[in-house]
Protein backbone atom coordinates (compact mmCIF):
# COMPACT_ATOMS: atom_id res chain seq x y z
CA UNK A 1 0.00 0.00 0.00
CA UNK A 2 1.08 3.68 -1.15
CA UNK A 3 0.68 6.03 1.80
CA UNK A 4 -0.92 8.86 1.40
CA UNK A 5 0.91 12.26 0.70
CA UNK A 6 0.41 15.59 -0.87
CA UNK A 7 1.37 15.69 -4.22
CA UNK A 8 4.21 18.11 -5.37
CA UNK A 9 3.36 21.17 -6.46
CA UNK A 10 2.79 21.56 -10.60
CA UNK A 11 2.51 17.55 -10.33
CA UNK A 12 -1.35 16.73 -10.66
CA UNK A 13 -2.34 15.07 -13.52
CA UNK A 14 -4.61 16.92 -16.01
CA UNK A 15 -4.48 13.64 -18.18
CA UNK A 16 -3.11 10.03 -18.62
CA UNK A 17 0.03 10.83 -20.59
CA UNK A 18 3.33 9.39 -20.95
CA UNK A 19 4.88 12.22 -18.42
CA UNK A 20 3.14 9.63 -15.72
CA UNK A 21 5.87 6.93 -16.20
CA UNK A 22 8.40 8.84 -14.80
CA UNK A 23 6.37 9.24 -11.26
CA UNK A 24 7.32 7.36 -8.53
CA UNK A 25 3.91 5.03 -6.91
CA UNK A 26 3.88 7.85 -4.50
CA UNK A 27 3.68 10.60 -6.92
CA UNK A 28 0.83 8.33 -8.71
CA UNK A 29 -0.83 8.04 -5.64
CA UNK A 30 -0.85 11.65 -4.69
CA UNK A 31 -1.26 13.55 -8.41
CA UNK A 32 -3.50 10.98 -10.19
CA UNK A 33 -7.10 10.99 -9.79
CA UNK A 34 -9.03 8.39 -10.16
CA UNK A 35 -11.87 9.13 -11.69
CA UNK A 36 -9.40 10.57 -14.23
CA UNK A 37 -7.95 7.60 -14.66
CA UNK A 38 -11.05 5.63 -14.93
CA UNK A 39 -12.42 8.14 -17.52
CA UNK A 40 -9.12 7.41 -19.33
CA UNK A 41 -8.65 4.16 -19.70
CA UNK A 42 -7.62 3.34 -23.21
CA UNK A 43 -4.57 5.76 -22.94
CA UNK A 44 -3.23 3.42 -19.51
CA UNK A 45 -2.75 0.49 -22.48
CA UNK A 46 -0.39 3.02 -24.25
CA UNK A 47 2.22 3.96 -21.81
CA UNK A 48 4.38 1.23 -20.37
CA UNK A 49 3.91 1.49 -16.85
CA UNK A 50 5.87 -1.10 -15.03
CA UNK A 51 4.60 -3.70 -13.05
CA UNK A 52 4.94 -1.85 -9.52
CA UNK A 53 3.19 1.54 -11.08
CA UNK A 54 0.59 -0.54 -12.30
CA UNK A 55 -0.09 -1.27 -8.84
CA UNK A 56 -0.95 2.07 -7.56
CA UNK A 57 -3.57 2.23 -10.92
CA UNK A 58 -4.96 -0.49 -9.31
CA UNK A 59 -5.47 0.49 -6.04
CA UNK A 60 -6.88 3.62 -7.50
CA UNK A 61 -9.52 1.94 -9.53
CA UNK A 62 -10.00 -0.65 -6.52
CA UNK A 63 -11.39 2.46 -4.20
CA UNK A 64 -12.81 3.66 -7.16
CA UNK A 65 -15.19 0.73 -7.50
CA UNK A 66 -15.41 -1.28 -4.70
CA UNK A 67 -18.30 -3.50 -5.67
CA UNK A 68 -16.56 -4.36 -9.32
CA UNK A 69 -15.53 -2.58 -12.56
CA UNK A 70 -17.47 -1.41 -14.94
CA UNK A 71 -17.38 -2.99 -18.43
CA UNK A 72 -16.13 0.40 -20.17
CA UNK A 73 -12.93 0.07 -17.65
CA UNK A 74 -12.57 -3.68 -17.96
CA UNK A 75 -12.14 -3.37 -21.73
CA UNK A 76 -9.21 -0.79 -21.56
CA UNK A 77 -7.00 -2.48 -18.93
CA UNK A 78 -4.94 -4.55 -21.07
CA UNK A 79 -1.35 -4.99 -18.65
CA UNK A 80 -3.47 -4.25 -15.64
CA UNK A 81 -5.09 -7.45 -16.02
CA UNK A 82 -2.11 -9.08 -15.11
CA UNK A 83 -2.70 -7.15 -11.73
CA UNK A 84 -6.45 -8.71 -11.02
CA UNK A 85 -7.25 -11.69 -8.40
CA UNK A 86 -9.74 -13.94 -9.50
CA UNK A 87 -11.44 -12.48 -6.36
CA UNK A 88 -11.34 -8.98 -8.33
CA UNK A 89 -12.75 -10.50 -11.22
CA UNK A 90 -15.72 -12.40 -9.52
CA UNK A 91 -16.95 -8.88 -8.92
CA UNK A 92 -17.12 -8.29 -12.73
CA UNK A 93 -20.35 -8.42 -15.41
CA UNK A 94 -18.36 -9.15 -18.73
CA UNK A 95 -20.87 -9.34 -21.66
CA UNK A 96 -18.79 -8.07 -24.61
CA UNK A 97 -16.68 -10.97 -26.42
CA UNK A 98 -14.37 -7.76 -27.36
CA UNK A 99 -13.88 -7.39 -24.00
CA UNK A 100 -13.22 -10.73 -23.83
CA UNK A 101 -11.01 -10.94 -26.48
CA UNK A 102 -9.21 -7.74 -25.09
CA UNK A 103 -8.00 -9.32 -22.08
CA UNK A 104 -6.99 -12.65 -23.17
CA UNK A 105 -4.73 -10.98 -25.60
CA UNK A 106 -2.87 -9.57 -22.77
CA UNK A 107 -2.14 -13.49 -21.50
CA UNK A 108 -1.61 -14.98 -24.89
CA UNK A 109 1.27 -17.06 -25.05
CA UNK A 110 1.33 -18.21 -21.46
CA UNK A 111 -0.80 -20.70 -19.64
CA UNK A 112 -4.16 -20.46 -18.45
CA UNK A 113 -4.08 -18.52 -15.66
CA UNK A 114 -6.21 -18.68 -12.25
CA UNK A 115 -7.37 -15.05 -13.60
CA UNK A 116 -8.28 -16.10 -17.19
CA UNK A 117 -9.89 -19.20 -15.40
CA UNK A 118 -11.97 -16.94 -13.73
CA UNK A 119 -12.63 -14.76 -16.48
CA UNK A 120 -13.53 -17.31 -19.16
CA UNK A 121 -16.37 -18.90 -16.36
CA UNK A 122 -17.35 -15.77 -15.61
CA UNK A 123 -18.17 -14.89 -19.30
CA UNK A 124 -19.56 -18.42 -20.38
CA UNK A 125 -21.97 -18.16 -17.48
CA UNK A 126 -23.12 -14.75 -18.32
CA UNK A 127 -24.07 -15.80 -21.25
CA UNK A 128 -26.13 -19.30 -20.29
CA UNK A 129 -24.09 -21.22 -22.63
CA UNK A 130 -20.98 -22.12 -24.69
CA UNK A 131 -21.69 -20.54 -27.84
CA UNK A 132 -20.14 -20.64 -31.04
CA UNK A 133 -18.48 -17.35 -31.49
CA UNK A 134 -17.04 -17.61 -27.60
CA UNK A 135 -15.97 -20.91 -28.55
CA UNK A 136 -13.87 -19.92 -31.39
CA UNK A 137 -12.70 -16.93 -29.43
CA UNK A 138 -11.47 -19.16 -26.00
CA UNK A 139 -9.94 -21.79 -29.04
CA UNK A 140 -7.94 -19.89 -30.81
CA UNK A 141 -6.04 -18.58 -27.61
CA UNK A 142 -5.73 -21.78 -25.48
CA UNK A 143 -6.51 -25.11 -27.64
CA UNK A 144 -6.93 -27.29 -25.08
CA UNK A 145 -9.85 -24.86 -23.30
CA UNK A 146 -12.51 -27.52 -24.33
CA UNK A 147 -10.60 -30.62 -22.67
CA UNK A 148 -10.40 -28.53 -19.28
CA UNK A 149 -14.04 -28.38 -18.95
CA UNK A 150 -15.91 -30.88 -16.88
CA UNK A 151 -18.56 -33.03 -18.45
CA UNK A 152 -21.64 -31.06 -16.88
CA UNK A 153 -20.14 -28.00 -18.17
CA UNK A 154 -19.35 -29.34 -21.81
CA UNK A 155 -23.33 -30.22 -21.62
CA UNK A 156 -23.81 -26.49 -21.80
CA UNK A 157 -22.25 -26.65 -25.33
CA UNK A 158 -24.63 -26.48 -28.12
CA UNK A 159 -24.39 -28.88 -30.95
CA UNK A 160 -23.59 -25.87 -33.03
CA UNK A 161 -21.14 -24.60 -31.08
CA UNK A 162 -19.32 -28.06 -32.60
CA UNK A 163 -18.36 -26.46 -35.83
CA UNK A 164 -15.66 -24.08 -34.04
CA UNK A 165 -13.37 -27.47 -32.52
CA UNK A 166 -10.64 -28.46 -34.29
CA UNK A 167 -9.03 -31.60 -33.71
CA UNK A 168 -5.73 -30.27 -31.95
CA UNK A 169 -8.82 -28.92 -28.95
CA UNK A 170 -9.60 -32.46 -28.30
CA UNK A 171 -6.04 -33.92 -27.52
CA UNK A 172 -6.33 -34.05 -24.29
CA UNK A 173 -10.05 -35.12 -23.37
CA UNK A 174 -10.79 -38.00 -21.83
CA UNK A 175 -13.51 -40.37 -22.96
CA UNK A 176 -15.97 -38.87 -19.97
CA UNK A 177 -15.77 -35.85 -22.11
CA UNK A 178 -15.97 -37.50 -25.75
CA UNK A 179 -19.06 -39.13 -24.12
CA UNK A 180 -20.53 -35.90 -23.99
CA UNK A 181 -19.64 -34.32 -26.78
CA UNK A 182 -19.22 -36.79 -29.59
CA UNK A 183 -23.60 -36.98 -29.59
CA UNK A 184 -23.54 -33.42 -30.25
CA UNK A 185 -21.06 -33.81 -32.93
CA UNK A 186 -23.14 -36.29 -34.72
CA UNK A 187 -25.82 -33.87 -34.69
CA UNK A 188 -24.01 -31.00 -35.84
CA UNK A 189 -22.44 -32.98 -38.74
CA UNK A 190 -25.68 -35.32 -39.60
CA UNK A 191 -26.31 -33.55 -42.62
CA UNK A 192 -23.29 -34.39 -44.30
CA UNK A 193 -22.19 -36.52 -46.95
CA UNK A 194 -20.32 -39.84 -45.91
CA UNK A 195 -16.10 -39.09 -46.47
CA UNK A 196 -17.15 -35.36 -45.24
CA UNK A 197 -18.92 -36.41 -42.34
CA UNK A 198 -15.89 -38.84 -41.38
CA UNK A 199 -13.35 -36.09 -41.54
CA UNK A 200 -15.21 -33.80 -39.08
CA UNK A 201 -16.65 -36.70 -36.79
CA UNK A 202 -13.06 -38.28 -36.64
CA UNK A 203 -11.27 -37.20 -33.38
CA UNK A 204 -14.91 -37.19 -31.51
CA UNK A 205 -15.18 -40.50 -32.11
CA UNK A 206 -13.55 -41.63 -28.72
CA UNK A 207 -16.90 -41.08 -27.36
CA UNK A 208 -18.73 -43.48 -30.06
CA UNK A 209 -20.85 -46.43 -28.91
CA UNK A 210 -20.39 -49.67 -30.88
CA UNK A 211 -23.84 -49.18 -33.38
CA UNK A 212 -22.38 -46.20 -34.66
CA UNK A 213 -18.70 -48.38 -35.40
CA UNK A 214 -20.55 -50.95 -36.90
CA UNK A 215 -22.09 -48.44 -39.49
CA UNK A 216 -18.94 -46.26 -39.87
CA UNK A 217 -17.41 -49.93 -40.78
CA UNK A 218 -20.14 -49.98 -43.97
CA UNK A 219 -18.84 -46.79 -45.29
CA UNK A 220 -15.24 -47.57 -46.37
CA UNK A 221 -13.87 -44.74 -43.93
CA UNK A 222 -10.07 -46.18 -43.52
CA UNK A 223 -9.78 -45.27 -40.28
CA UNK A 224 -6.28 -44.40 -38.72
CA UNK A 225 -4.34 -46.16 -35.85
CA UNK A 226 -4.30 -43.41 -34.09
CA UNK A 227 -8.45 -42.67 -34.02
CA UNK A 228 -8.95 -46.59 -33.74
CA UNK A 229 -6.72 -46.55 -30.46
CA UNK A 230 -8.85 -44.03 -28.64
CA UNK A 231 -11.82 -45.76 -29.57
CA UNK A 232 -13.74 -46.86 -25.78
CA UNK A 233 -12.57 -50.34 -25.59
CA UNK A 234 -16.14 -51.46 -24.61
CA UNK A 235 -17.48 -49.84 -27.81
CA UNK A 236 -14.77 -51.98 -29.78
CA UNK A 237 -15.36 -55.33 -27.83
CA UNK A 238 -18.61 -56.54 -30.09
CA UNK A 239 -17.07 -55.81 -32.89
CA UNK A 240 -16.39 -59.03 -35.43
CA UNK A 241 -13.15 -59.40 -37.18
CA UNK A 242 -15.03 -58.32 -40.34
CA UNK A 243 -16.34 -55.24 -39.28
CA UNK A 244 -12.88 -54.09 -37.67
CA UNK A 245 -11.19 -54.98 -41.22
CA UNK A 246 -13.59 -52.66 -43.07
CA UNK A 247 -13.11 -50.13 -40.68
CA UNK A 248 -9.41 -49.75 -40.67
CA UNK A 249 -9.47 -51.13 -44.54
CA UNK A 250 -5.46 -50.84 -45.43
CA UNK A 251 -4.84 -49.88 -41.43
CA UNK A 252 -6.00 -53.04 -40.74
CA UNK A 253 -2.33 -53.79 -40.65
CA UNK A 254 -1.45 -51.92 -37.85
CA UNK A 255 -3.25 -54.28 -35.69
CA UNK A 256 0.01 -56.22 -35.54
CA UNK A 257 1.93 -53.52 -34.02
CA UNK A 258 -0.41 -52.71 -31.19
CA UNK A 259 -1.76 -56.34 -30.15
CA UNK A 260 -0.18 -55.45 -26.41
CA UNK A 261 -2.30 -52.42 -26.14
CA UNK A 262 -5.54 -51.43 -25.34
CA UNK A 263 -8.15 -51.80 -26.95
CA UNK A 264 -7.05 -54.27 -29.19
CA UNK A 265 -5.21 -56.45 -26.95
CA UNK A 266 -8.68 -56.92 -25.44
CA UNK A 267 -10.74 -57.05 -28.58
CA UNK A 268 -8.11 -60.21 -29.83
CA UNK A 269 -9.02 -61.71 -27.07
CA UNK A 270 -12.85 -61.61 -27.68
CA UNK A 271 -12.03 -62.96 -31.42
CA UNK A 272 -12.15 -66.57 -32.38
CA UNK A 273 -8.64 -67.67 -33.76
CA UNK A 274 -10.02 -68.94 -36.84
CA UNK A 275 -11.52 -65.44 -37.33
CA UNK A 276 -8.18 -63.41 -36.45
CA UNK A 277 -6.17 -65.84 -38.51
CA UNK A 278 -8.24 -64.34 -41.78
CA UNK A 279 -6.87 -61.34 -41.33
CA UNK A 280 -3.26 -62.53 -41.98
CA UNK A 281 -1.27 -60.89 -39.51
CA UNK A 282 -0.61 -63.52 -36.73
CA UNK A 283 -2.64 -62.23 -34.21
CA UNK A 284 -3.23 -64.66 -31.16
CA UNK A 285 -6.98 -65.01 -29.64
CA UNK B 1 15.65 -15.12 -34.26
CA UNK B 2 15.39 -11.63 -33.07
CA UNK B 3 18.15 -9.36 -34.30
CA UNK B 4 18.83 -5.80 -34.39
CA UNK B 5 21.56 -5.07 -36.31
CA UNK B 6 23.30 -1.29 -35.96
CA UNK B 7 24.82 0.95 -38.18
CA UNK B 8 28.92 1.82 -38.13
CA UNK B 9 31.18 3.01 -36.06
CA UNK B 10 30.96 7.50 -36.32
CA UNK B 11 33.64 10.12 -35.33
CA UNK B 12 31.71 13.24 -34.79
CA UNK B 13 32.79 17.01 -33.82
CA UNK B 14 31.91 18.56 -30.90
CA UNK B 15 28.74 20.17 -31.99
CA UNK B 16 27.49 17.90 -34.64
CA UNK B 17 25.06 15.84 -34.78
CA UNK B 18 24.94 11.96 -34.85
CA UNK B 19 21.96 9.22 -36.34
CA UNK B 20 22.19 5.33 -35.45
CA UNK B 21 20.39 3.21 -37.01
CA UNK B 22 18.64 0.43 -36.09
CA UNK B 23 17.21 -2.61 -38.73
CA UNK B 24 14.94 -5.52 -36.59
CA UNK B 25 14.07 -8.67 -38.09
CA UNK B 26 12.76 -11.68 -36.70
CA UNK B 27 9.91 -10.40 -34.87
CA UNK B 28 6.66 -7.90 -35.64
CA UNK B 29 8.74 -4.48 -35.50
CA UNK B 30 5.57 -2.88 -34.44
CA UNK B 31 4.76 -4.31 -31.75
CA UNK B 32 8.07 -3.53 -29.18
CA UNK B 33 8.77 -0.42 -28.00
CA UNK B 34 12.48 0.01 -29.14
CA UNK B 35 14.72 1.40 -26.27
CA UNK B 36 18.27 3.27 -26.24
CA UNK B 37 20.77 2.58 -24.00
CA UNK B 38 24.22 4.40 -24.26
CA UNK B 39 27.79 3.45 -22.42
CA UNK B 40 30.66 5.18 -22.23
CA UNK B 41 34.50 3.38 -22.13
CA UNK B 42 34.96 1.59 -18.90
CA UNK B 43 31.36 3.11 -17.84
CA UNK B 44 27.40 1.15 -17.16
CA UNK B 45 25.01 1.90 -18.86
CA UNK B 46 22.60 4.45 -19.18
CA UNK B 47 19.12 4.42 -20.84
CA UNK B 48 17.81 7.56 -22.77
CA UNK B 49 14.11 6.40 -24.16
CA UNK B 50 12.34 4.73 -26.40
CA UNK B 51 10.04 4.99 -29.08
CA UNK B 52 6.94 2.80 -30.24
CA UNK B 53 7.30 2.09 -33.97
CA UNK B 54 3.26 1.35 -34.15
CA UNK B 55 1.97 4.65 -32.66
CA UNK B 56 5.22 6.95 -33.32
CA UNK B 57 5.23 8.04 -29.18
CA UNK B 58 8.29 8.81 -27.33
CA UNK B 59 9.57 8.81 -23.92
CA UNK B 60 12.94 10.49 -23.19
CA UNK B 61 14.84 10.25 -20.27
CA UNK B 62 15.09 14.01 -19.18
CA UNK B 63 18.91 14.25 -19.00
CA UNK B 64 18.45 13.82 -23.33
CA UNK B 65 15.31 15.67 -23.44
CA UNK B 66 15.38 18.68 -26.14
CA UNK B 67 18.78 16.83 -27.77
CA UNK B 68 17.80 13.36 -28.64
CA UNK B 69 15.02 12.19 -31.25
CA UNK B 70 14.10 8.97 -31.88
CA UNK B 71 11.99 8.27 -35.01
CA UNK B 72 11.35 5.04 -36.96
CA UNK B 73 10.82 3.90 -40.58
CA UNK B 74 8.11 0.84 -40.52
CA UNK B 75 8.56 0.31 -44.01
CA UNK B 76 12.12 -1.01 -43.52
CA UNK B 77 11.61 -2.07 -40.04
CA UNK B 78 14.20 0.47 -38.69
CA UNK B 79 14.75 2.41 -36.20
CA UNK B 80 16.68 5.55 -35.65
CA UNK B 81 18.38 7.63 -32.68
CA UNK B 82 19.27 11.22 -33.66
CA UNK B 83 21.65 13.35 -30.77
CA UNK B 84 22.18 16.22 -31.46
CA UNK B 85 25.09 19.18 -29.85
CA UNK B 86 27.65 16.68 -29.04
CA UNK B 87 29.84 17.06 -26.58
CA UNK B 88 32.62 14.64 -25.53
CA UNK B 89 30.67 13.22 -22.61
CA UNK B 90 28.56 11.83 -25.29
CA UNK B 91 31.49 9.85 -26.31
CA UNK B 92 29.82 5.56 -25.86
CA UNK B 93 28.70 2.99 -27.29
CA UNK B 94 24.92 3.54 -28.42
CA UNK B 95 22.68 -0.21 -28.10
CA UNK B 96 18.81 -0.31 -29.33
CA UNK B 97 17.48 -3.19 -27.19
CA UNK B 98 13.70 -4.42 -27.14
CA UNK B 99 11.60 -5.17 -24.05
CA UNK B 100 9.40 -7.56 -24.70
CA UNK B 101 6.94 -7.29 -21.63
CA UNK B 102 6.34 -3.32 -21.38
CA UNK B 103 5.06 -4.16 -17.84
CA UNK B 104 8.69 -5.62 -17.02
CA UNK B 105 11.15 -3.31 -18.56
CA UNK B 106 13.73 -5.71 -19.14
CA UNK B 107 16.49 -5.93 -22.01
CA UNK B 108 15.42 -9.11 -23.82
CA UNK B 109 17.39 -8.43 -26.72
CA UNK B 110 19.79 -6.09 -27.49
CA UNK B 111 21.72 -4.43 -30.98
CA UNK B 112 24.94 -5.55 -31.49
CA UNK B 113 26.00 -1.67 -30.53
CA UNK B 114 27.51 1.69 -32.39
CA UNK B 115 30.51 3.18 -31.16
CA UNK B 116 30.43 6.60 -31.55
CA UNK B 117 33.49 9.32 -30.55
CA UNK B 118 33.01 12.73 -30.42
CA UNK B 119 36.86 14.39 -30.79
CA UNK B 120 37.80 17.54 -31.81
CA UNK C 1 16.06 8.67 -9.75
CA UNK C 2 16.97 5.01 -8.40
CA UNK C 3 21.03 4.61 -7.59
CA UNK C 4 22.05 1.31 -8.02
CA UNK C 5 25.10 0.83 -6.34
CA UNK C 6 26.98 -2.34 -7.06
CA UNK C 7 30.16 -4.16 -5.21
CA UNK C 8 33.01 -4.86 -5.23
CA UNK C 9 34.13 -3.10 -8.58
CA UNK C 10 36.30 -5.82 -9.65
CA UNK C 11 36.35 -9.26 -8.12
CA UNK C 12 39.03 -12.56 -8.88
CA UNK C 13 37.63 -15.75 -8.04
CA UNK C 14 39.29 -19.46 -8.62
CA UNK C 15 37.92 -21.56 -11.53
CA UNK C 16 35.12 -23.98 -9.26
CA UNK C 17 34.80 -21.16 -6.81
CA UNK C 18 31.79 -18.90 -5.63
CA UNK C 19 31.55 -15.57 -7.38
CA UNK C 20 29.02 -13.35 -5.05
CA UNK C 21 27.74 -9.90 -6.58
CA UNK C 22 25.86 -7.22 -4.55
CA UNK C 23 23.44 -4.11 -5.50
CA UNK C 24 22.09 -1.85 -3.93
CA UNK C 25 19.15 0.28 -4.27
CA UNK C 26 18.70 3.88 -3.23
CA UNK C 27 14.89 3.17 -3.02
CA UNK C 28 12.72 -0.16 -2.40
CA UNK C 29 12.36 -1.72 -5.76
CA UNK C 30 10.40 -4.71 -4.59
CA UNK C 31 11.98 -7.31 -6.49
CA UNK C 32 12.09 -5.80 -10.20
CA UNK C 33 15.86 -6.08 -10.31
CA UNK C 34 17.49 -7.89 -13.98
CA UNK C 35 21.01 -8.93 -13.92
CA UNK C 36 22.96 -8.45 -17.56
CA UNK C 37 26.71 -10.75 -18.47
CA UNK C 38 28.52 -8.52 -20.89
CA UNK C 39 31.59 -10.17 -22.17
CA UNK C 40 34.32 -8.09 -23.88
CA UNK C 41 33.21 -6.61 -27.15
CA UNK C 42 29.67 -8.05 -27.21
CA UNK C 43 26.42 -6.35 -25.95
CA UNK C 44 24.66 -6.88 -22.54
CA UNK C 45 23.01 -10.88 -22.23
CA UNK C 46 20.03 -10.88 -19.88
CA UNK C 47 20.52 -13.09 -17.45
CA UNK C 48 18.22 -13.17 -14.36
CA UNK C 49 14.92 -10.96 -13.51
CA UNK C 50 12.42 -10.57 -10.36
CA UNK C 51 15.85 -10.55 -8.84
CA UNK C 52 15.55 -14.36 -8.79
CA UNK C 53 13.94 -15.60 -11.98
CA UNK C 54 16.46 -17.64 -14.56
CA UNK C 55 16.42 -16.45 -18.78
CA UNK C 56 15.79 -19.20 -20.67
CA UNK C 57 18.97 -20.95 -21.76
CA UNK C 58 21.08 -19.89 -18.53
CA UNK C 59 23.03 -22.26 -16.79
CA UNK C 60 21.72 -22.90 -13.29
CA UNK C 61 25.14 -22.08 -11.76
CA UNK C 62 23.67 -18.46 -11.71
CA UNK C 63 21.30 -17.37 -8.61
CA UNK C 64 19.70 -14.32 -8.13
CA UNK C 65 18.19 -13.34 -4.84
CA UNK C 66 16.96 -10.41 -2.64
CA UNK C 67 14.00 -8.21 -2.44
CA UNK C 68 13.82 -4.18 -1.46
CA UNK C 69 16.93 -2.67 -1.97
CA UNK C 70 19.62 -5.42 -1.45
CA UNK C 71 20.41 -7.81 -4.34
CA UNK C 72 22.94 -10.64 -4.94
CA UNK C 73 24.07 -12.45 -8.12
CA UNK C 74 25.73 -15.76 -6.93
CA UNK C 75 27.65 -18.24 -9.64
CA UNK C 76 27.89 -21.68 -7.54
CA UNK C 77 30.84 -22.59 -9.59
CA UNK C 78 32.64 -20.52 -11.75
CA UNK C 79 33.90 -21.76 -15.13
CA UNK C 80 35.88 -19.65 -17.50
CA UNK C 81 33.59 -18.29 -19.76
CA UNK C 82 31.78 -16.71 -16.95
CA UNK C 83 34.52 -14.02 -17.37
CA UNK C 84 32.55 -10.88 -18.15
CA UNK C 85 31.05 -7.40 -16.45
CA UNK C 86 27.67 -7.94 -14.57
CA UNK C 87 25.25 -5.50 -14.54
CA UNK C 88 22.38 -5.05 -12.32
CA UNK C 89 18.95 -3.02 -13.38
CA UNK C 90 16.06 -1.71 -11.69
CA UNK C 91 12.30 -2.02 -13.48
CA UNK C 92 10.85 -0.83 -10.37
CA UNK C 93 10.42 3.16 -12.25
CA UNK C 94 11.47 4.93 -14.87
CA UNK C 95 14.01 6.05 -15.56
CA UNK C 96 15.27 2.61 -15.63
CA UNK C 97 18.87 2.52 -13.98
CA UNK C 98 21.51 0.11 -14.10
CA UNK C 99 24.72 -0.57 -11.57
CA UNK C 100 28.19 0.40 -12.91
CA UNK C 101 29.08 -2.95 -13.23
CA UNK C 102 31.44 -5.64 -11.89
CA UNK C 103 34.70 -7.02 -13.34
CA UNK C 104 34.74 -10.69 -13.16
CA UNK C 105 37.75 -12.66 -13.35
CA UNK C 106 39.85 -15.67 -12.74
CA UNK C 107 42.74 -15.76 -9.83
Known amino acids: EVEKTACPSGKKAREIDESLIFYKKWELEACVDAALLATQMDRVNAIPFTYEQLDVLKHKLDELYPQGYPESVIQHLGYLFLKMSPEDIRKWNVTSLETLKALLEVNKGHEMSPQVATLIDRFVKGRGQLDKDTLDTLTAFYPGYLCSLSPEELSSVPPSSIWAVRPQDLDTCDPRQLDVLYPKARLAFQNMNGSEYFVKIQSFLGGAPTEDLKALSQQNVSMDLATFMKLRTDAVLPLTVAEVQKLLGPHVEGLKAEERHRPVRDWILRQRQDDLDTLGLGLQG | QVQLVQSGAEVKKPGASVKVSCKASGYTFTSYWMHWVRQAPGQGLEWMGM????????IYYEKFQGRVTMTVDKSISTAYMELSRLRSDDTAVYYC?????????????WGQGTLVTVSS | DIVMTQSPDSLAVSLGERATINCKAS??????VAWYQQKPGQSPKLLIY???TRHSGVPDRFTGSGSGTDFTLTISSLQAEDVAVYFCQQYSSYPLTFGAGTKLEIK
Open chain 2, 51 to 58: IHPNSDNT
Open chain 3, 27 to 32: HDVGTS
Open chain 3, 50 to 52: WAS
Open chain 2, 97 to 109: AIIITPVVPKFDY
